[in-house]
Amino acid sequence: QFLKEGQLAAGTCEVIAAHRDSSQPRRTIARQTARCACRKGQIAGTTRARPACVDARIIKTKQWCDMLPCLEGEGCDLLINRSGWTCTQPGGRIKTTTVS
């Protein structure tokens, strides 16, 4: 079973577009679009700060930290109303991700 050109292996993702906006002081807004080929019971999400296929039940319950979205060593916390999550680096810098 060989992959055709442009075909993703099951359970994997690739970034197809990225955009950064640094126009506001002390704040960078980054947007990323990914293409994923997820297995049954999975859905596109974020693991270790990269696009990944994750357990679909995580998205349903909005337990975003269950995707392991932060880098190892960072702390993950849910935003109020479960609208996203924050990753806190050991130095205290916080990266916020909102789900739209």
Epitope: A9, A10, G11, R39, K40, D66, L68, E72, G73, C76
Partner: antibody, heavy 113, light 107 residues
């Protein structure tokens, strides 16, 4: 980075037993934590998994027989009513993508009268 | 529920020879397969994930291949220290499942 299990001992059938897994060098909340067991001279059996939120999933045969829970520093496995078939070495192991990259050395549970 | 049939249950190999262990899945697991080595009294250690990705520190004589329902672990140029039991593990969905194991003896 390492894992260590504790709490394994000789118990009589029906006496609940709790095993504990302690992590060193990494945060449990950054991984999915699993329990796997191995009866003497037999193969490996996955018991279940716990997510950072506390969500758990179990193998069909393990539902009702085991309970996985966690604190910020440990992951516990409770054997609710042990029988002789539960005699095994119990391992905790961590995953991110579904395969087990770090295992503890295991703790032996013997169920006997 | 996924079933993994591992063959052969045991085998004997000579130093320098080649060992092949097969793992047959009851359904397509989309390359979500890992291989472990276990020595007596020790926990398993991860050799290969994603069918063919060698873990850091694992000698290159170990290799994995396969797709769909058919997967293989190959040890080329077997060494005495490769005497162990080898397990395959599928992780395409829950429950996570192991093969029954293959005991490799080195002559």
């Amino acid at each position: 980075q390492s894992l260590e299990e504790s709490g394994g001992r000789l118990v009589t059938p029906g006496t609940p037993l709790t095993l504990t897994c302690t992590a060193s060098g990494f945060s449990l909340s950054s991984y999915y934590m699993n329990w796997v067991r191995q009866a003497p001279g037999k193969g490996l059996e996955w018991i279940g998994i716990i997510y950072p939120s506390g969500t758990t999933y179990y193998a069909g045969w393990a539902k009702g027989r085991f309970t996985i829970s966690k604190t910020s520093t440990t992951v516990d496995l409770k054997i609710t009513s042990p029988t002789s078939e539960d005699t095994a070495t119990y391992f905790c192991a961590r995953t991110v993508s579904g395969y087990f990259d770090i295992w503890g050395p295991g703790t032996l549970v013997t169920v006997s009268l | 529920e996924l079933d993994l049939t591992q063959t052969p249950p045991s085998l004997s190999a000579s130093v320098g020879g080649t060992v092949t262990i097969n793992c047959l899945a009851s359904e397509d697991i989309y390359s979500a397969l890992a291989w472990y080595q276990q020595k007596p009294g020790k926990p398993p250690t991860l050799l290969i994930s994603g069918t063919s990705n060698l873990e850091s520190g694992v000698p290159p004589r170990f290799s994995g291949s396969g797709s769909g329902t058919d997967y293989t672990l190959t040890i080329g140029g077997v060494q005495a220290e490769d005497a162990a039991t080898y397990f395959c593990q599928g992780y395409s969905s829950y429950p996570l499942t192991f093969g029954a194991g293959t005991n490799v003896e080195i002559k």
